[in-house]
């Protein structure tokens, strides 16, 4: 056997080159036949009136033909025949790759609530071979479940992703990425997650700066509530007691001037949105005012006392339930 061919893999619409090569040529006629065993070329003559076939090279040792605008119907075995005695035959297989026609991502809900499980589907249509679909949430790869549908040698792949969403997922892209031998580079489509979540509440002491509250001083607390949708109502209450008469409420701020021991207690900031409500507590302890020591007649001694305030916040952020957030001064 001195007749040689090579298999060809080509992307739909591109050009396939078929070559029949003879190692030891004796000027025997070379013929190329299609999968239906119709003669495409006999020497340099083309009996088939398909102008997509063009002669690239013709000699006693090679018949080289190009096939332009390849379609899936061109796939199959092409036969090279050498009219020796006995005749020789060799075949080359043309494999046609078809990239996915289009890529569609479909998200079950435009807006999800934290903790909810949503379904995301991605479909890669009419490819050959079947497309591999990969899922990413941001930079993290996730596992989907794929179903392949075959129709007329073409494959449509649908991958389903079940995704439990968290508040951190808000604004993060869910990416459907395809891997296919006919696709170079990244073919992907994405949708951004919109996640609604109950408020997160933080209390910040904006005055006094050193964090030590003494009789006669002023206190200013600011309540920061972040949620989606943004909390519409932020309220201050005093737990198990009335708000002091001299307390001033201004939006998220609570001012108490001229602190005294009767102001001791727990002050709560509450915030809510359509997802749920949350609160944070601040435990106020009013210290004695600094004592003034009369100066001795002969010597002066300065004593510096440093008090450290530790603020501990414990958060329970279960939707729809009240959280117990306590700020404790030691």
């Amino acid at each position: 056997q001195n007749l040689f061919t090579k298999d060809v893999t080509v992307i739909e619409g591109e050009v396939a080159t078929i070559s029949c090569q003879v190692n030891k040529s004796d000027d025997s006629v070379i013929q190329l036949l299609n999968p239906n065993r119709q003669t495409i070329y006999f020497r340099d003559f083309r009996p088939l009136k398909d102008s997509r076939f063009q002669l690239l090279n013709f000699s006693s040792s090679e018949l080289k033909v190009s096939l332009t605008n390849v379609s899936i119907s061109d796939e199959g075995r092409y036969f090279c025949q050498l009219y020796t005695d006995p005749p020789q035959e060799s075949y080359t297989t043309i494999t046609v790759l078809v990239p996915p026609r289009n890529l569609m991502i479909d998200i079950q809900k435009d807006t999800a609530v934290e903790g909810e499980e949503i379904e995301v589907n991605c479909t890669a249509m009419a490819s050959k071979p079947a497309t591999t679909i990969r899922w990413f949430k941001g930079n993290t790869e996730l596992k989907g479940k794929s179903e392949v549908e075959e129709w007329s040698d073409m494959y449509t792949v649908t991958s389903q992703l079940m995704l439990k969403v968290h508040k951190e997922d808000d604004g993060v892209p869910v990416i459907c990425q395809v891997e296919h031998p006919a696709v170079t580079g990244n073919l992907q489509t994405q949708r951004y997650l919109e996640v609604q979540y109950k408020p997160q509440v933080h209390i910040q002491m904006t005055y006094p700066l050193q964090g030590l509250t003494r009789e006669g001083d002023a206190l200013e607390l600011t309540c920061e509530a972040i949620g989606k949708p943004q909390p519409v109502m932020v309220t201050w209450v005093r737990v198990d007691d009335e708000m002091p008469q001299h307390a001033v409420l201004s939006g998220p701020n609570l001012f108490i001037n001229n602190l005294n021991k009767t102001d001791n207690g727990t002050y709560r900031c509450e915030a809510s949105n359509i997802v749920g409500k949350a609160h944070s507590d601040y435990m106020l302890y009013v210290y004695d005012p600094p004592t003034t020591i009369p100066p001795p007649t002969t010597t002066t001694t300065t004593t510096t006392t440093t008090t450290t305030t530790i603020l501990t916040i414990i958060t329970d952020s279960r939707a729809g339930e009240e959280g117990s957030i306590r700020a404790v001064d030691h």
Epitope: V29, R43, D44, F45, R46, P47
Partner: nanobody
């Protein structure tokens, strides 16, 4: 220009014979390989036979091997196809063709208008 005119077609009974002729002009007939190609109703073109420049080498499709004979007369610029033991599946339009160049280096496939062969009882 290259001109190929086929003749000799007609209606014949299964098992009968016909001889097709192709008169060539406009090119150096003796310098080019010649071919017979046919097209059955509703089918694609099918290569039938080929002959080299001198007529010493002939080639046939498996479907006609042993029944058809190709020949040429370079003095008369004529190509022939002797068809024996005809079958209904031989019913087709038969074309004479060549790949020749006229006054240029470029080679072109040239076809006649065809002659109809019908095999029927």
């Amino acid at each position: 220009q290259v001109q190929l005119v086929e003749s000799g077609g007609g209606l014949v009974q299964p098992g009968g014979s016909l001889r097709l002729s192709c008169a060539a002009s406009g090119f150096t007939f003796s310098s080019y390989w010649m071919y017979w190609v046919r097209q059955a109703p509703g089918k694609g073109l099918e290569w039938v036979s080929a002959i080299n420049t001198g007529g010493g080498s002939t080639y046939y499709a498996d479907s006609v091997k042993g029944r058809f004979t190709i020949s040429r007369d370079n003095a008369k610029n004529t190509l022939y196809l002797q068809m024996n033991s005809l079958k209904p599946e031989d019913t087709a339009l038969y074309y004479c063709a060549t790949r020749a160049s006229v006054g240029t280096l470029e080679m072109y496939d040239n076809w006649g208008q065809g002659t109809q062969v019908t095999v029927s009882s």
